[in-house]
C-alpha cells in the first residue's frame, strides 16, 4: 500500500542504488518515486562532519523485502517512494529555494526582473531543467538580477551549496506549464541522426515516447520495430537530443518510427505508466515472482500490486497452466523496461500499474442507463 | 484497416459487425456496444437500406467466415439516425441500433465506456482502430478483425488536409502524416477507441476519408463526445415509450 | 427548398469582363462545396470552376485557368464567377450547382445535387 | 484528365423499351464519384443517380445505376414518355472533372 510517512532524523542503511543531489526531502522523495528501482530513500538536510560535500545528498535505496534497518542520524530525514500511492503522484515540483546554489552546467544567462520570470524563462526553454537566480543583494553586482538557466545529464543538481542572496528552482515543464508547444507527430519508416542519450527496449512506439518524456534528457526517439533488419536493434527506443532542441531532418528508414518528447505539453502529458497489454509479446527481464492469475488483466493487476515489479509476462501454453489459471511472471530491469521482447503466440505481456495516476475501474463515467 | 494486424479473441468485446442479409449476406459495416440493448454505429451505413428486418448484427466475433446460418444474431428493433443527417453532407454521421433482445455479457462480448462531455478537450495518446474493413483501398472484406494504432491529428490540421470539406467540432480526425496506416471501406462505423486513465473509451465512429491511408490524408471519424446528450436523450425517450406501451 | 439563383450573363465583345452571382436558399450555404458548370449551344456540359466551402481553394479547368475567378461570400450566401478576357468560345449558358459530398462505404460521395436555371453569356463583337 | 466516353451517341426507342446507356471512363474512378444527370432542352440538368448506383431523391426506381472501375452502365427498365432526354455521365474523382458527350434518348 501507500506509505507517505516521513521519519526525521533516521537514516535507512545499505540498499543502495543511486546518490543525487536534492534541495529538500520532498524532491528527494520524488525522484525516488519515479526511479524504476527506488523504494525507500534517505536525505541529508545536515551536513555530516567532515563530509560537507554529502549535505543535500538524496540517497535512492532498494529492498527486496520492501524495508531497511534504520539508523538514528541527526540531521537525515527518510521515506519510502510514494509508487503506489495514486492521487500523491506528481513529477511537479514548483518551491522556490531561498539561499541556495543548484549548480549544473550553466548554458543561459540573462537578465530578468524576477524569480518568477527566471522560473518561467526555464519552463519555456527546451533545455532547462533548473535555474539559479541572483537577486538585486548578490554580493557580485554584475551579477545581481541574472537568471541562470542550467542542465546536467541527470536532470538534477551536480551540487547544491548554500549561498545568501541565491534562489533556486526546477523547470515546471513537469507542471504542464511549459508554453513551448506539443508536437505530437509521429513520423513512420522515418529515423533521426542525432544524439543518443540511452536506449531502451520497447513494445512500440508509443511507450518509448513516453519513456522519452520522463528521461530528463529526451527530446526526441527513434524507435525501431521486430522488422527492424539488425536483430539487436529490434524493438529497442533511442532516446536523442541535440544542441539545438530540433532533430536534424529526419531520414527515410523502413520499420523506424520517430517522435518527440511530449514533456513540454501542456493536456496531452502521458502518465508515467503503459496501460496496454501486448498479445503475443513475452517480456524478458529478471524474475521477480511467478502466481497462477486468470487471463492478463489479472496479471497485470497483480503486478501493479507487487511495488517491485515493473512488467510481467502472462503465458497460455499448456505447460503453464493449471486449474487456478496460468503464468503470471512478474519482472523487474534496471532501468524499467524489458532486456528483451520476443513474440510468442502463447503470451501476453504488460507493465504495472503503479505509477499512474488514476486507479483502474471497469465502471464507465457516462451511464447510459442514466438520464 | 489499412496496416494492421489480427486481432485476438475479446481484445476488443464491444466490437460488432453489422451485416446485410439480402440474397446473400454481406459485411456492411461495424459498430460498437455501448449496453445491453444498445449499438452506436455511423449513420451512412444505412443509406439506401435503413429497413431494420434486413439486418443482422453480429457480437463476440474473431473470424468472419466462421459465421454459418446456426451462429446466434441479433435483431434491429429500432433504428435511430440523427436527425440532421443529411446524405449530401458529411455531418451527423451517428446512429444507434436498439436491439430485439438484450445481449449477454461475456469476456468476449461487453460494453465500451462512452467519454464524458468533459471529454471533448481530452487528448489522447493511445488509441485504436478496429474492423473487418479492407486492407488497401481496393481490397475486400477480412475474415479476421484487423487492430491498428493511430494518432489523433488536431481538428485545425485536418482542416488543411480537407480543404474540400467542413471538419466541425462534431468531428475528430485520426492517421499519421506519412499515411499508411488507417481505416477503410468497411470498417465505417467501428470504434476508434482510446486508453485514458486505465480506461477504454469510445472516443470516435469510423465515418469517412479520402481513399485508405494516404499521404496527408487522415481518416475522420465522429466524435462521440460531442453527442453524449443525443445519446442519452435516445435511449431515455426509448426506454419511456417502453414504458408507455407496455401493459400496466 | 433549395434553391440556385444565378444572374449577370449578357452579351459581352471579346477581351470584356463579366461577373456572374449565384444566390443560394435553403441550405447552410458555408457547409457546402459550389461550382460552376457551363454548355455551349447544341454542345455537352463543361465543368468550369469548384470552390471549397469556407473560399480557401479553387480549382479551374485548363480552358478558363488565369481568366475566370470563382469566389463566394457566406455571409450573403452568393457565389461569384468573374470573367475576364473573354473569347467567344466562352458563349454558353452558365450554371451554378451545390456539391453534395455524403458519405458512402467510408469514403466521400460527390455529385451536383441541385443547380440553378442558368444564365446566357455572349461573347460576340 | 479523365476522359468520359459514352455510347451510343444517340438511342432510339419506344416508350416501355428498356434503354442501356454506357459510360467508359480513361482511367480507374471510385464509384462514388461517378454520377448520372439527365437533361431536357431549355432545362438545367437534373441528378438521376450518384456514386455509382444510388437513386436521388424522388428519382423513379425504374432509373438505376451499376458498375466500377472503368465500366459504368445506366438502365432504365421501362422508357416513359418523359424520359427521352439527354444523359450525361459525370466523374469528380480527380481535377479536372469531367462530364461524358451525353447519349441522347429519341423516340423511334
Known amino acids: 500500500g501507500c506509505l507517505s510517512q516521513l521519519y526525521a532524523n533516521t537514516f535507512f542503511r545499505g540498499g543502495d542504488l543511486a546518490a543525487i543531489y536534492t534541495p529538500d526531502a520532498q524532491h528527494c522523495q520524488k525522484m525516488c518515486t519515479f526511479h524504476p528501482r527506488c523504494l525507500l530513500f534517505s536525505f541529508l538536510a545536515v551536513s555530516p562532519t567532515k563530509e560537507t560535500d554529502k549535505r543535500f545528498g538524496c540517497f535512492m535505496k532498494e529492498s527486496i523485502t520492501g524495508t531497511l534497518p534504520r539508523i538514528h542520524r541527526t540531521g537525515a530525514i527518510s521515506g519510502h517512494s510514494l509508487k503506489q500511492c495514486g492521487h500523491q503522484l506528481s513529477a511537479c515540483h514548483q518551491d522556490i529555494y531561498e539561499g541556495l546554489d543548484m549548480r549544473g552546467s550553466n548554458f543561459n544567462i540573462s537578465k530578468t526582473d524576477s524569480i518568477e520570470e527566471c522560473q518561467k524563462l526555464c519552463t519555456n526553454n527546451i533545455h532547462c531543467q533548473f535555474f539559479t537566480y541572483a537577486t538585486k543583494a548578490f554580493h557580485r553586482p554584475e551579477y545581481r538580477k541574472s537568471c541562470l538557466l542550467k542542465r546536467s545529464s541527470s536532470g538534477t543538481p551536480t551540487s547544491i551549496k548554500p549561498v545568501d542572496n541565491l534562489v533556486s528552482g526546477f523547470s515546471l515543464k513537469s507542471c504542464a506549464l511549459s508554453e513551448i508547444g506539443c508536437p505530437m507527430d509521429i513520423f513512420q519508416h522515418f529515423a533521426f541522426a542525432d544524439l543518443n542519450v540511452s536506449h531502451v527496449v520497447t513494445p512500440d512506439a508509443f511507450v518509448c515516447r513516453t519513456v522519452c518524456t520522463f528521461h530528463p534528457n529526451c527530446l526526441f526517439f527513434t524507435f525501431y520495430t521486430n522488422e527492424w533488419e539488425t536483430e539487436s536493434q529490434r524493438n529497442v527506443c533511442f532516446l536523442k537530443t541535440s544542441k539545438s532542441g530540433r532533430p536534424s531532418p529526419p531520414i527515410i528508414q523502413e520499420n523506424a518510427v520517430s517522435g518527440y518528447s511530449l514533456f513540454t505539453c501542456r493536456k496531452a502529458r502521458p502518465e508515467p505508466c503503459h496501460f496496454k497489454i501486448y498479445s503475443g509479446v513475452a517480456f524478458e527481464g529478471e524474475e521477480l515472482n511467478a502466481t497462477f492469475v486468470q487471463g492478463a488483466d489479472a496479471c497485470q493487476e497483480t503486478c501493479t500490486k507487487t511495488i517491485r515489479c515493473q512488467f510481467f509476462t502472462y503465458s497460455l501454453l499448456p505447460q503453464d497452466c493449471k486449474a487456478e489459471g496460468c503464468k503470471c511472471s512478474l519482472r523487474l530491469s534496471t532501468d524499467g523496461s524489458p532486456t528483451r521482447i520476443t513474440y510468442e503466440a502463447q503470451g501476453s505481456s504488460g507493465y504495472s500499474l503503479r505509477l499512474c495516476k488514476v486507479v483502474e475501474s471497469s465502471d464507465c463515467t457516462t451511464k447510459i442507463n442514466a438520464r | 484497416i489499412v496496416g494492421g494486424t489480427n486481432s485476438s479473441l475479446g481484445e476488443w468485446p464491444w466490437q460488432v459487425s453489422l451485416q446485410v442479409k439480402l440474397v446473400s449476406q454481406n459485411h456492411m459495416c461495424g459498430g460498437s456496444i455501448i449496453g445491453r440493448q444498445w449499438i452506436l454505429t455511423a449513420a451512412h451505413c444505412f443509406d439506401g437500406i435503413p429497413y431494420p428486418d434486413v439486418w443482422r448484427i453480429y457480437g463476440g466475433i474473431l473470424n468472419l467466415s466462421e459465421i454459418t446460418n446456426k451462429t446466434p444474431f441479433s435483431s434491429i428493433k429500432e433504428l435511430i439516425i440523427h436527425q440532421k443527417y443529411k446524405m449530401s453532407e458529411g455531418s451527423y454521421d451517428i446512429a444507434l441500433i436498439k436491439l430485439q433482445t438484450p445481449l449477454n455479457y461475456t469476456e468476449f462480448q461487453k460494453p465500451i465506456c462512452l467519454p464524458s462531455k468533459a471529454d471533448t478537450n481530452t487528448i489522447y495518446t493511445n488509441c485504436w482502430v478496429t474492423g473487418w474493413g479492407y486492407t488497401k483501398e481496393r481490397g475486400e472484406t477480412q475474415n479476421i478483425l484487423q487492430k491498428a494504432t493511430i494518432p489523433l491529428v488536431p481538428n485545425e490540421e485536418c482542416q488543411k488536409k480537407y480543404r474540400d470539406y467542413v471538419i466541425t467540432k462534431q468531428m475528430i480526425c485520426a492517421g499519421y502524416k506519412e499515411g499508411g496506416i488507417d481505416a477503410c471501406k468497411g470498417d465505417s462505423g467501428g470504434p476508434l477507441v482510446c486508453k485514458h486513465s486505465g480506461r477504454w473509451q469510445l472516443v470516435g465512429i469510423t465515418s469517412w476519408g479520402e481513399g485508405c491511408a494516404r499521404k496527408e490524408q487522415p481518416g475522420v471519424y465522429t466524435k462521440v463526445a460531442e453527442y453524449i446528450d443525443w445519446i442519452l436523450e435516445k435511449i431515455q425517450s426509448s426506454k419511456e415509450r417502453a414504458l408507455e406501451t407496455s401493459p400496466a | 427548398e433549395v434553391q440556385l439563383l444565378e444572374s449577370g450573363g449578357g452579351l459581352v465583345q471579346p477581351g470584356g469582363s463579366l461577373r456572374l452571382s449565384c444566390a443560394a436558399s435553403?441550405?447552410?450555404?458555408?457547409?457546402?462545396?459550389m461550382t460552376w458548370v457551363r454548355q455551349a449551344p447544341g454542345k455537352g456540359l463543361e465543368w468550369v470552376s469548384y470552390i471549397s466551402p469556407s473560399g480557401g481553394h479553387t480549382i479551374y479547368a485548363d480552358s478558363v485557368k488565369g481568366r475566370f475567378t470563382i469566389s463566394r461570400d457566406n455571409s450573403k450566401n452568393t457565389l461569384y464567377l468573374q470573367m475576364n478576357s473573354l473569347r467567344a468560345e466562352d458563349t454558353a449558358v452558365y450554371y451554378c450547382a451545390r456539391v453534395a459530398r455524403g458519405i458512402a462505404a467510408r469514403s466521400r460521395t460527390s455529385y451536383f445535387d441541385y443547380w440553378g436555371q442558368g444564365t446566357l453569356v455572349t461573347v460576340s463583337s | 484528365e479523365i476522359v468520359l466516353t459514352q455510347s451510343p451517341g444517340t438511342l432510339s426507342l419506344s416508350p416501355g423499351e428498356r434503354a442501356t446507356l454506357s459510360c467508359r471512363t480513361s482511367q480507374f474512378v471510385n464509384s462514388n464519384y461517378l454520377a448520372w444527370y439527365q437533361q431536357k432542352p431549355g432545362q438545367a440538368p437534373r441528378l438521376l443517380i450518384y456514386g455509382a448506383s444510388s437513386r436521388a431523391t424522388g428519382i423513379p426506381d425504374r432509373f438505376s445505376g451499376s458498375g466500377s472501375g472503368t465500366d459504368f452502365t445506366l438502365t432504365i427498365s421501362r422508357l416513359e414518355p418523359e424520359d427521352f432526354a439527354v444523359y450525361y455521365c459525370q466523374q469528380s474523382s480527380r481535377t479536372p472533372w469531367t462530364f461524358g458527350q451525353g447519349t441522347k434518348v429519341e423516340i423511334k
Open positions: 435553403g441550405f447552410t450555404f458555408s457547409h457546402y462545396l
